[in-house]
Each structure stands twice: as structure tokens, then as C-alpha cells.
């Protein structure tokens, strides 16, 4: 069904990092255009990118309502010039997407170390504390106001001179770690939500070592 | 667990009007879309109306359009079904059901039963 | 308004045959169409929705199928509380519609 020379949209899919989250469809119009329209399971349908040429749709500002909730996205496909016409059934042609739930399946970004520095033998690493665009009275949230306590951090470092690596975590931004005296060492971490069955971990984060290690212990 | 239980039902003559509840537990229900679904004695089922979480989006099927209308009241967890100018035809079973994006229906009342009859 | 037709309208099995009912559409409705079971005097319960998506709680000897006019609904084998009666329903657009049913007995 549907009208002439409009054809559904197909391969609805998801694209979100840290609540950014973008729907992203095909095939590229020809002599169509598209509108979006995003709900949770209240049925109550928002219309978003009304009548674009575009082949994708940010939806943050949508979903960061409440990103526990699961939303259902729907893609509608109307003739180019002629956006009152419908189907054969008096009705535009659509496509839902999958579901989606965004604290189940944004991917994490990669993380950030902010920061090493040494007390005595110890480092502490310090992981940049990522500001989402999930506000709350009025203010943005950060990943771990968002998270909370699922979110766990990786530490992985190792002597520059052996490839032995070691493995530290967290759920907070900070570790403090054993280090030998005199030696250097790299660090790269890693985001992990052990509550979610997949899609649980970040990209590794750009890994950072320390230089000239002697004068940062003082000698 | 899911529970959702009609009233309201019973025996009413041709022209008459009756007041279905649906009271909601065991999830947050201004979540959800709700709906009606009917099943006349010894028929199939038969989508009746539909309602989206805020209450702002309804739909009816053309038998029933300007004679009942569905509503809710989320601070009561509560669906109703008015139906005015009743017939014949609409002694059925009425079942409320919750009803994710307004689709599919996951779960169901136990229905109750209207009769319409002189 | 879409036309949703069963086949069979009833069928007779034995416990553990593999069982087929389809339903079709008068025109396309993608995936959107779901499946109940309903027992006699009893409220129908989800067993299907988007077609293949089984319903949280049903067991996996059921199974849905199809996309577009034709879908079919598999019990992978049959087990005496499966003998009720099963409806198909689009959800593509309203009024949204149902299948008359196919009554499954036992054979």
C-alpha cells in the first residue's frame, strides 16, 4: 500500500553516545520527504524533522526526558510537494524502529584521564567526569549523576618498560594506585555498566604516560 | 504484576447509557496507552477505542464514534469507557487492556459484561 | 479499514504435533501484528507482537513470522494447555482489526 513513487523508510537504527542520540534511516529520497515522530509506551506521538530530505534525526532532546524510559520511533514518507497526500489507505507509509532505551543502550564515550598525580608511591588518576545533555533542574548532568553507582571505571596500566598490564576499578572518578619508585608508567581507561547484559563498555580511553617519572617523584 | 479489572457492566436497554472502569495496578499507568476491546457472545474480538497516556490522543472504531467515549483519570489509575445510545449490537464482553505505543495489547482485564436488552 | 483473514478457521491436533496458523492482511502492514491466545471464558493473553517478538513470559515453542501481507503464527509442539483459540491483529492503522480466529482442538 502507500503512494505511488514513495516508498517506506527501512534500517531504523539507533545511534546515541552518552544520550546523544541521533535515528538514522534509508534510502536517501527521491521525490519524497520525511517527518519522525518518537513516543514512549504512553502512545502520546511527538512529530519531529518535519518533511526533511535529511536521512537522519536527532532525538536527544527528546529522549533525555526520562532515559529510562524505552521509546519507539516511527518514520513517516510523504510524496515531494505534496505532503497532505497519503496511501491507499488514507494514511502516510511509515516504519517504526526498534525499541530503545536509553540508559540500557547509549554507548559509552570513550572516557578522558583528566590527571595523574603521584602521592608518595601511589598515583591517583583522575577520569574527566563527562557532562551528558540529560538535564535536571535546569542543569546538564554529568555521566555519573546519571549513572550513578552502575558506572564503573577501568584502570589499566602498566611499567613503559614491560607490557604486563594490571587492573584497577572504581565507581567513583578516581583511583589510587601502588606505583614503584622510578619507574614510568601509562594508564588508559575504560567506562563499564556491569548491569547491562550488552553493550556494556567504553572504547578504551587515549592512553597517557607519564614522563620524565624521575623529577615528577623529585629526584 | 500487571492487573487491571473492569466494571461498570451489566443489563441496560436500547438508548441507554453505562460507565465502564478499568482500575490500573502493578505499573505506572499514566505510562501507557489503554484500550477497549469488545467480544460479542460466541464472536471474535473487536478493537473498540484507545487512549494515549496523557489522555490527550483518542481513537475510536466507526461503530461506536459520537456515542462512547474513552478517558482516564492517571491520578486514580483509572480507564473509563462512557457509551451512550446503546444497542443492541454492543452486548459484548468489554476487556481493557494496556496497550505499549498504543499498539499491541501485553496485557488484560477479566472484561465485564454488558447486555443491552429490552 | 485492513481485513485480517485466519487459516485455518479450526484445526485438530495431538500433543507435541508442530502447528501452523497464518493471517493475512488485506494490504501491507510491515510488522505491526500481534498474536493472542484466549481460552474459553477466560481474557486473551499476549503471545506475539512486531510479528516474531515474543511476549515477556511465553514460552519458546511459540513463534511468529512474516512481514508485509502474510504472517504465521508456529507452536513447535503442541502441550494440552495450548488447545484455545488464536487471534491475529494489525496495528499498522485504525481501526486497528483482528482476525476472526482459528480454534485449535484436540484431536
Known amino acids: 500500500s502507500g503512494t505511488t513513487n514513495t516508498v517506506a523508510a527501512y534500517n531504523l537504527t539507533w545511534k546515541s553516545t552518552n544520550f546523544k542520540t541521533i535515528l538514522e534511516w534509508e534510502p536517501k529520497p527521491v521525490n519524497q520527504v520525511y517527518t519522525v515522530q518518537i513516543s514512549t509506551k504512553s502512545g502520546d506521538w511527538k512529530s519531529k524533522c518535519f518533511y526533511t530530505t535529511d536521512t537522519e534525526c536527532d532525538l536527544t532532546d527528546e529522549i533525555v526526558k526520562d532515559v529510562k524510559q524505552t521509546y519507539l520511533a516511527r518514520v513517516f514518507s510523504y510524496p515531494a510537494g505534496n505532503v497532505e497526500s497519503t496511501g491507499s489507505a488514507g494514511e502516510p507509509l511509515y516504519e517504526n524502529s526498534p525499541e530503545f532505551t536509553p540508559y540500557l543502550e547509549t554507548n559509552l564515550g570513550q572516557p578522558t584521564i583528566q590527571s595523574f598525580e603521584q602521592v608518595g608511591t601511589k598515583v591517583n588518576v583522575t577520569v574527566e567526569d563527562e557532562r551528558t545533555l540529560v538535564r535536571r533542574n535546569n542543569t546538564f548532568l554529568s555521566l555519573r549523576d546519571v549513572f550513578g553507582k552502575d558506572l564503573i571505571y577501568t584502570l589499566y596500566y602498566w611499567k613503559s618498560s614491560s607490557s604486563g598490564k594490571k587492573t584497577a576499578k572504581t565507581n567513583t572518578n578516581e583511583f589510587l594506585i601502588d606505583v614503584d619508585k622510578g619507574e614510568n608508567y601509562c594508564f588508559s581507561v575504560q567506562a563499564v555498566i556491569f548491569s547491562r547484559k550488552t553493550n556494556h563498555k567504553s572504547p578504551e580511553s587515549i592512553t597517557k604516560c607519564t614522563e620524565q617519572w624521575k623529577s615528577v617523584l623529585g629526584e | 504484576e500487571v492487573q487491571l479489572l473492569e466494571s461498570g457492566g451489566g443489563l441496560v436497554q436500547p438508548g441507554g447509557s453505562l460507565r465502564l472502569s478499568c482500575a490500573a495496578s502493578?505499573?505506572?499507568?499514566?505510562?501507557?496507552?489503554m484500550s477497549w476491546v469488545r467480544q460479542a457472545p460466541g464472536k471474535g474480538l473487536e478493537w473498540v477505542s484507545s487512549?494515549?497516556?496523557?489522555?490527550?490522543?483518542?481513537y475510536y472504531t466507526d461503530s461506536v464514534k459520537g456515542r462512547f467515549t474513552i478517558s482516564r483519570d492517571n491520578s486514580k489509575n483509572t480507564l473509563y469507557l462512557q457509551m451512550n445510545s446503546l444497542r443492541a449490537e454492543d452486548t459484548a464482553v468489554y476487556y481493557c487492556?494496556?496497550?505499549?505505543?498504543?499498539?499491541?495489547?501485553?496485557?488484560w482485564g477479566q472484561g465485564t459484561l454488558v447486555t443491552v436488552s429490552s | 479499514d485492513i481485513q485480517m483473514t485466519q487459516s485455518p478457521p479450526s484445526l485438530s491436533a495431538s500433543a507435541g504435533d508442530r502447528v501452523t496458523i497464518t493471517c493475512r492482511a488485506s494490504?501491507?502492514?510491515?510488522?505491526?501484528l500481534a498474536w493472542y491466545q484466549q481460552k474459553p471464558e477466560k481474557a486473551p493473553k499476549s503471545l506475539i507482537y512486531?510479528?516474531?517478538s515474543l511476549q515477556s513470559g511465553v514460552p519458546s515453542r511459540f513463534s511468529g513470522s512474516g512481514s508485509g501481507t502474510d504472517f504465521t503464527l508456529t507452536i513447535s509442539s503442541l502441550q494440552p494447555e495450548d488447545f484455545a483459540t488464536y487471534y491475529c491483529?494489525?496495528?499498522?492503522?485504525?481501526?486497528?482489526?483482528f482476525g476472526q480466529g482459528t480454534k485449535l482442538e484436540i484431536k
Open positions: 502493578g505499573f505506572t499507568f499514566s505510562n501507557y496507552a
Open positions: 512486531a510479528a516474531s
Open positions: 491483529q494489525q496495528y499498522n492503522s485504525y481501526p486497528y482489526t
Open positions: 487492556a494496556r496497550s505499549p505505543w498504543g499498539y499491541y495489547l501485553d496485557s
Open positions: 487512549i494515549s497516556g496523557s489522555g490527550d490522543y483518542t
Open positions: 494490504q501491507g502492514i510491515s510488522s505491526r
